[in-house]
């Protein structure tokens, strides 16, 4: 299994290094998750031809995956630290059900899928400490999530492969946009 951030050999070799700041810890955590996604995408792409499909073809899906928009304040035009932070946390909370779906979708990367899920939970905690306006963060309804999970798991094999690919790609894009914005904060 991948080693969580802060526990790699480089850290062991440098025991006198300054402890990471909150921002550095978040940055490292997101990069760790991106590494995990990269490994999962490799397995997915080796197993099916989804990765060759055009973005336009894949866009025709019923998944309501979180996505950054101009109004979220995470892009340079209209950048707003607090609005953006709320969007990042809300989006990550919405992704959790999809990360749960991924748990039984991998054979050789089962531990990696679990690591991505658990690391995302830790990331949410880091970000919640950073946010001032926690009241603005809406938590997904557990009942809705449960029925969504059941629906996704009932799909045929091809649709499940497509769903897996879309979740990984969307989650990667969301994390990249989030990290770019966080690096401005």
């Amino acid at each position: 299994a991948p080693v969580p951030p802060g526990e790699d050999s480089k850290d062991v070799a440098a025991p006198h290094r300054q402890p990471l700041t909150s921002s550095e810890r978040i940055d490292k955590q997101i990069r760790y998750i991106l590494d995990g996604i990269s490994a999962l995408r490799k397995e997915t792409c080796n197993k099916s031809n989804m990765c060759e499909s055009s973005k336009e073809a894949l866009a025709e899906n019923n998944l309501n995956l979180p996505k950054m928009a101009e109004k979220d304040g995470c892009f340079q035009s209209g950048f707003n630290e607090e609005t953006c932070l709320v969007k990042i946390i809300t989006g990550l909370l919405e992704f959790e059900v999809y990360l749960e779906y991924l748990q039984n979708r991998f054979e050789s990367s089962e531990e990696q899928a679990r690591a991505v899920q658990m690391s995302t939970k830790v990331l949410i905690q880091f970000l919640q400490k950073k946010a001032k306006n926690l009241d603005a963060i809406t938590t997904p309804d557990p009942t809705t999530n449960a029925s969504l999970l059941t629906k996704l798991q009932a799909q045929n094999q091809w649709l499940q492969d497509m769903t897996t690919h879309l979740i990984l790609r969307s989650f990667k894009e969301f994390l990249q946009s989030s990290l770019r914005a966080l690096r401005q904060m």
Epitope: L34, F75, K172, Q176, S177, R180, R183
Partner: nanobody, 123 residues
Framework: EVQLVESGGGLVQAGGSLRLSCTAS????????MAWFRQAPGKEREFVTD???????WYADSVKGRFTISRDNAKNTVYLQMNSLRPEDTAVYYC?????????????????WGQGTQVTVSS
């Protein structure tokens, strides 16, 4: 790690335009965030602009509205279109790549760098 080669620099008069190119080899270019930094004589290297894997762009305030970054993944190339050039834009311009596809306004976010191309703006 990706190798980067910049081109397109030169001498131009104030108010003029230049287009810099940076061509990458040795990696999956489309998955990298690409950036331009610059270093004027006697000054620190500073962020100019970047473009993420999914195409989002950021600009330094000093170049906003004058410079445009774009990428052509089929050609493994990132461009910097510089218009309304000023003498203070004179610098060596460096191309940089971030393998996480994110980018950012600090040098530490990038794992590959080009050798740089000189841009001189005369008044």
């Amino acid at each position: 790690e990706v190798q980067l080669v910049e081109s397109g620099g030169g001498l131009v008069q104030a108010g003029g335009s230049l287009r810099l190119s940076c061509t990458a080899s040795g990696g999956t270019f489309s998955e990298y965030a690409m950036a331009w930094f610059r270093q004027a004589p006697g000054k620190e290297r500073e962020f100019v602009t970047d473009i993420g894997e999914s195409g989002g762009t950021w600009y330094a305030d000093s170049v906003k509205g004058r410079f445009t970054i774009s990428r052509d993944n089929a050609k493994n190339t990132v461009y910097l279109q510089m218009n309304s050039l000023r003498p203070e834009d004179t610098a060596v311009y460096y191309c940089a790549a971030d393998s996480y596809g994110v980018g950012g306004g600090a040098e530490r976010y990038y794992d590959s760098w080009g050798q740089g191309t000189q841009v001189t703006v005369s008044s």
